[in-house]
């Protein structure tokens, strides 16, 4: 009889179930870019295919300049894969000649930009050491969490060295957000 | 991986039309842009226009009204129809898939993956 | 349409030379410039996007640089498989023109 008494408000409570296909996402893959002057303490923001191969932005959630720009207030559970490569031989070089240009560490940050907030934001990031690895290296490095976001939220993806990012493939290096 | 397969070679009288396919494997046209260029003797490439992914065409000005692209996704092939042929139309004409890229802010199109050519010859 | 005008229009050179080709385009293409190598019989070949970016598996002689409307392509040691006809391409705007082509000569 409690349960009975206790359906009706029950129902009340919880709204409707949104079907998954209304809700904003994002699947963005790699391309080709080349490297621009940045700020010494600023990892540089990648670009990423919107459109072509298979990246798509469905239900308002849109890409520009950069930017993944949330549409709707929520948790979303937001994720990127980034494949460096390089040569060895260039961690040899910074060992015995101090060389700075070359990294002996490689960097992915997801950054979260909010016009209200003067300061981005970093909600993961993920390092690698690049200087143990054979001859012709290849390291992905992976992040993925979830975030309560807000409408006009904007995300975007940084890494310590845009030379080194593999391009060579769409299933190599992404970037991507959908609302739970 | 990427391949464009394009059709053999065809000789044609003038004012007459020729259709060239370019069957791609690795990837599916409705989702990259298929452009046509040409080469014809001693002279240079000449881009003619692109098979958009999601179906439009833009065709150079200079064959407007000539040229036709078209597309048949369930085998995964572009068509260059180009018609009322000249001997000056007599070209190697290529299907290439374009790929993006960006400097700055800007982003811009280059044809990384190239078909293997089709000679088309223009005699009477 | 935008015009690209590369010079010269031939180069004669032998193994191990330097070697540069120069494109201009007719209008500011912001660096929206592609270099192809094309060889008789083949298909043409990306070597540059972006002005100077290195297409991947493309060997490190090959550079390239510039901006505005004046772009270079370099190859710093001539080797034989290298003689072709190259071709710059604007990637900036419908028609995407190519530059009529430079043809490299063994010397």
């Known amino acids: 009889l409690k349960g009975q008494e206790f359906a009706p408000s029950h129902q009340q409570v919880y709204a409707p179930l949104r079907a998954d296909g209304d809700k904003p996402r994002a699947h963005l893959t790699v391309v080709r870019q080349t490297p621009t002057q940045h700020f010494k303490n600023q990892f540089p923001a990648l670009h990423w295919e919107h459109e072509l191969g298979l990246a798509f932005t469905k239900n308002r959630m849109n890409y520009t300049n950069k930017f993944l720009l949330i549409p709707e207030s929520g948790d979303y559970f937001i994720y990127s894969q980034v494949t460096f490569r390089g040569m060895t031989s260039e961690c040899s070089e910074i060992r015995q000649a101090g060389r700075p240009n070359k990294p002996d560490s490689i960097t992915v940050v997801i950054t979260k930009v909010t016009d209200s907030y003067p300061e981005p934001t970093q909600l993961l990031m993920g390092t690698k050491s690049v200087c143990e690895v054979g001859s012709n290296w290849f390291q992905p490095i992976y992040l993925g969490a979830m975030f309560s976001l807000q409408e006009g939220d904007k995300l975007m993806v940084n890494v310590s060295d845009i030379s080194l990012v593999d391009y060579t493939k769409e299933d190599k290096t992404f970037f991507g957000a959908f609302l739970l | 991986q990427v391949q464009l397969v394009q059709s053999g070679a065809e000789v044609k009288k003038p004012g007459a039309s020729v259709k060239v396919s370019c069957k791609v494997s690795?990837?599916?046209?409705?989702?990259?842009?298929v452009h046509w260029v040409r080469e014809a003797p001693g002279q240079g490439l000449e881009w003619m226009g692109v098979?958009?992914?999601?179906?439009?065409?833009d065709y150079n000005s200079k064959f407007q009204g000539r040229v036709t692209m078209t597309r048949d996704t369930s085998t995964n092939t572009v068509y260059m129809e180009l018609s009322s042929l000249r001997s000056e139309d007599t070209a190697v004409y290529y299907c290439?898939?374009?790929?993006?890229?960006?400097?700055?802010?800007?982003?811009?199109?280059?044809?990384?993956?190239w078909g293997q050519g089709t000679l088309v010859t223009v005699s009477s | 349409d935008i015009q690209m005008t590369q010079s010269p229009s031939s180069v004669s050179a032998s193994v191990g030379d330097r070697v540069t080709i120069t494109c201009r385009a007719s209008?500011?293409?912001?660096?929206?410039l592609a270099w192809y190598q094309k060889k008789p019989g083949k298909s043409p070949k990306l070597l540059i996007y972006?002005?100077?970016s290195l297409q991947d598996g493309v060997p490190s002689r090959f550079s390239g640089s510039g901006s505005g409307t004046d772009y270079t392509l370099t190859i710093s040691s001539l080797q034989p498989e290298d003689f072709a006809t190259y071709f710059c391409?604007?990637?900036?705007?419908?028609?995407?023109?190519f530059g009529q082509g430079t043809k490299l000569e063994i010397k």
């Open positions: 290439a898939r374009a790929g993006r890229y960006y400097v700055d802010s800007n982003y811009y199109w280059d044809f990384p993956y």
């Open positions: 690795g990837f599916s046209v409705t989702s990259y842009n």
């Open positions: 098979m958009w992914y999601g179906g439009n065409t």
């Open positions: 209008e500011d293409i912001y660096s929206g």
């Open positions: 972006g002005a100077s």
């Open positions: 391409q604007e990637g900036l705007k419908s028609p995407y023109t």
